[in-house]
């Protein structure tokens, strides 16, 4: 059943999530800036067709619209999405020495956010019994594909985080 903002989520959890979303958004923006400055890959919209051919997936948040938010489904989709992005970021490993440290920090911050979501699901008795298995990740055949993949993954992740932020902020409203 849909649950509105007056749900059972603690304010401390929501504030922690908002913090983490903004930290990851900062990491993602740093990755995008470096890809743009170093490789002139500045416009994800120009790489959409390549994204389709590489099979870079999107993470849905269909259970999270503020008008009919389903708490368990929304948290589960948030966690699954973060789990997906962990795999996508892992596939980008070795993208370039200049981008390595930024990508490393982004990867860990996404993992930590997934942990925060899971902790809360566990406390509410909503945690799935088993970890979802990682689906097939895109294989990048060249350095260019990996860098272009980086632009698209960062762009997808930022979109996912923008929706997440709106949902969490809506839930955090008294």
């Amino acid at each position: 059943t849909p649950l509105g903002p007056a749900s059972s989520l603690p304010q401390s959890f929501l504030l922690k999530c908002l913090e983490q979303v903004r930290k990851i958004q900062g990491d993602g923006a740093a990755l995008q800036e470096k890809l743009c400055a170093t490789y002139k890959l500045c416009h994800p919209e120009e790489l959409v067709l390549l994204g389709h051919s590489l099979g870079i997936p999107w993470a849905p948040l269909s259970s999270c619209p503020s008008q009919a938010l389903q708490l368990a489904g929304c948290l589960s989709q948030l966690h699954s999405g973060l789990f997906l992005y962990q795999g996508l970021l892992q596939a980008l490993e070795g993208i370039s020495p200049e981008l390595g440290p930024t990508l490393d920090t982004l990867q860990l911050d996404v993992a930590d956010f997934a942990t925060t979501i899971w902790q809360q699901m566990e406390e509410l008795g909503m945690a799935p019994a088993l970890q979802p298995t990682q689906g097939a990740m895109p294989a990048f055949a060249s350095a260019f594909q990996r860098r272009a993949g980086g632009v698209l993954v960062a762009s997808h992740l930022q979109s996912f985080l923008e929706v997440s932020y709106r949902v969490l902020r809506h839930l955090a409203q008294p």
Epitope: G87, D104, L108, A111, T115, Q131
Partner: antibody, heavy 119, light 112 residues
Framework: QVQLVQSGAEVKKPGASVKVSCKAS????????MHWIKQAPGQGLEWIGY????????NYNQKFRDRATLTADKSTSTAYMELSSLRSEDTAVYYC????????????WGQGTLVTVSS | DIVMTQSPLSLPVTPGEPASISCRSS???????????LYWYLQKPGQSPQLLIY???NLASGVPDRFSSSGSGTDFTLKISRVEAEDVGVYYC?????????FGQGTKLEIK
């Protein structure tokens, strides 16, 4: 309650390898990253790297990338750190510590494992 | 890598007196989300380190309120209002803004 129990002290010869284990209990093991930290005798703390057991992904401090290998066994809730081509400067206490965000980061530590490298 | 520098390295204190430890980072630890990613850990003799302070100024669970921490983006101070015998050990500042995580050299607090 959360517990991290590490394997016992090891004495190794230069050039050998060592594998230290860290058995976790009291929480859902794959959900949290596990970090490893080195403390040489009378020295400070040095971050080696971490393993994300849920996807088997490990990340390393550049200094340890060539010789450290971090793994995790979800079935036994155990994280491992293997150090190869040992030299005298690897003599240290090695700690595992559970990752997380905010007040969760390194809130739980193993008791430490002393690795002595001596000919 | 972000370099963390602590001072003093040794701090003899009389019980009941205040104590102060400084830590400086080579890069600002203040993120655009408003959080400063600076932590303090205490390693008591013969023990593993324990979390004292997270995100610059928040006391970890079970830490007495005689401990406090403040700072800017790069300069931080851990204060103990009245030192007790159980506070002896090595205090480390650490950053988790970015990888690799790095620690200060440690400050050894001892009772005079």
């Amino acid at each position: 309650q959360v517990q991290l129990v590490q394997s016992g002290a090891e004495v190794k010869k230069p050039g050998a390898s060592v594998k230290v284990s860290c058995k976790a209990s009291g929480y859902t093991f794959p959900i949290y990253t596990m970090h490893w930290i080195k403390q040489a005798p009378g020295q400070g703390l040095e971050w080696i790297g971490y393993i994300n057991p849920s996807i088997g992904y490990a990340n390393y401090n550049q200094k340890f990338r060539d010789r450290a290998t971090l793994t995790a066994d979800k079935s036994t809730s155990t994280a491992y750190m293997e150090l190869s081509s040992l030299r005298s400067e690897d003599t240290a206490v090695y700690y595992c510590a559970r990752g997380g965000y905010g007040d969760s980061l390194f809130a739980y530590w193993g008791q430490g494992t002393l690795v002595t490298v001596s000919s | 890598d972000i370099v963390m520098t602590q001072s003093p390295l040794s701090l003899p204190v009389t019980p009941g007196e205040p104590a102060s430890i400084s830590c400086r980072s080579s890069k600002s630890l203040l993120h655009s989300n408003g959080i400063t990613y600076l932590y303090w850990y205490l390693q008591k003799p013969g023990q593993s380190p324990q979390l004292l302070i997270y995100q610059m100024s928040n006391l970890a669970s079970g830490v007495p309120d005689r401990f406090s921490s403040s700072g800017s983006g790069t300069d931080f101070t851990l204060k103990i209002s009245r030192v007790e015998a159980e506070d002896v050990g090595v205090y480390y500042c650490a950053q988790n803004l970015e990888l690799p995580y790095t620690f200060g050299q440690g400050t050894k607090l001892e009772i005079k």
